[in-house]
């Protein structure tokens, strides 16, 4: 999917409400600065795709990020505000309700959790710094 | 509007036990803050004493951590701060402080303090 | 443990004036997120201290912009841009990349 045409506001304005508490809430105390950031994104677009991926896309290590509540919020803020989204996640969406698994949190998932919290942080300041771009035009 | 309190004895004898409690007030313990003690000796410094988790995890400075235990209690709204074998290096004002993240999980920015309780170590 | 190291120890300044602190980590602040761990606490006479900034630069929610934070790695620098009255006080830095955290010895701000 192409993030190009997102409502990116929107997107922050959702995730400073309710997605970035889900979060900070599954990292349970865990703190930033215990993980390294080895995931990154040089703009919005960019930003949005390593989200996606992070955050739905399974990993040996961490396989069920997709049904906790972040995620859930995370997809339907994608829905809402981008055109076309929804649409390209149902085929997905059914492949994943066969691979559930039970809910464990583990050391992986943290640190995983804690790459979210850097690409959304990136998202944000790519965000910040385009307005205050324009602001001076 | 968020308020911590500390409470407890002004005065302990050498080698006891000092305790004390941080009455929250505004937010609750179980939010997904860290509750921490920091002290100051009279005309000195800040130390980091430790702090707390509401699921119990803990973090101590390793110069106390021998002597230092944090608790919490959910159903009080509260934390403790108890520092056995007490000596006169002990006696500071000591302060309970909230740790919040910010919005990308950033902790380690005090924003809200007791007041401050000044424990003195004598016989 | 990081050590803190702040100086001068005491500054003297007329109000009006501009006053700048320095705070240096014995080891780098700066995390692989690009963020610097130290903050900027006061503390006014019989108070208890009050953050200033949070995260190298970020003023924290109330604070007036005649205060800014600046550095990066192990070298800091607290900046008021025009010192008033009811800026006295004991200045820390304080690391916050990892436990112990970690104080600078702090500055005292004196009206001359």
């Known amino acids: 999917y192409d993030f190009t045409n997102c409502d990116f506001q929107k997107i922050e304005a959702d995730y400073l409400r309710t997605i970035s508490k889900d979060l900070i809430t599954y990292m349970s105390g865990t703190k930033s600065t215990d993980f390294n950031n080895t995931v990154s994104c040089s703009n919005r677009p960019h930003c949005l795709t390593e989200i996606q991926s992070l955050t739905f896309n399974p990993t040996p290590r961490c396989a069920s990020l997709a049904k906790e509540m972040f995620a859930r919020k995370t997809k339907a803020t994608l829905a809402l505000w981008c055109p076309g989204y929804s649409e390209t996640q149902i085929n997905a969406t059914q492949a994943m309700k066969k691979r559930r698994k039970r809910k464990v949190t583990t050391n992986k998932c943290l640190e995983q959790v804690s790459q979210l919290l850097g690409l959304w942080r990136r998202f944000i300041r790519t965000l910040l710094k385009k307005q205050h771009h324009h602001h001076h035009h | 509007q968020v308020q911590l309190q500390e409470s407890g004895p002004g005065l302990v004898k050498p080698s006891g036990t000092l305790s004390l409690t941080c009455a929250v007030s505004?937010?609750?313990?179980?939010?997904?803050?860290?509750w921490n003690w920091v002290r100051q000796p009279p005309g000195k410094g800040l130390q980091w004493i430790g702090e707390?988790?509401?699921?119990?995890?803990?973090n101590y400075n390793p110069s106390l951590k021998s002597r230092v235990t944090i608790s919490v209690d959910m159903s009080k709204n509260q934390f403790s701060l108890k520092l056995s074998s007490v000596t006169a290096a002990d006696t500071a004002v000591y302060f309970c402080?909230?740790?919040?993240?910010?919005?990308?999980?950033?902790?380690?920015?005090?924003?809200?303090w007791g007041q401050g309780i000044l424990v003195t170590v004598s016989s | 443990d990081i050590v803190m190291t702040q100086s001068p120890l005491s500054l003297p300044v007329t109000p009006g004036e501009p006053a700048s602190i320095s705070c240096r980590s014995s080891?780098?602040?700066?995390?692989?997120?690009?963020?610097?761990?130290l903050d900027w606490y006061l503390q006014k006479p019989g108070q208890s201290p009050q953050l200033l900034i949070y995260?190298?630069?970020d003023r924290a929610s109330g604070v007036p912009d005649r205060f800014s934070g600046s550095g990066s790695g192990t070298d800091f620098t607290l900046k008021i841009s025009r010192v008033e009255a009811e800026d006295v006080g004991i200045y820390y830095c304080?690391?916050?990349?990892?436990?112990?955290?970690?104080f600078g010895q702090g500055t005292k701000l004196e009206i001359k």
């Open positions: 505004g937010d609750s313990i179980s939010s997904d803050n860290w």
């Open positions: 402080a909230r740790d919040a993240p910010n919005d990308y999980g950033d902790y380690g920015f005090f924003d809200y």
């Open positions: 707390i988790f509401h699921s119990g995890r803990t």
């Open positions: 304080m690391q916050a990349l990892q436990t112990p955290y970690t």
């Open positions: 080891q780098s602040l700066l995390h692989s997120n690009e963020y610097n761990y």
């Open positions: 995260l190298g630069s």
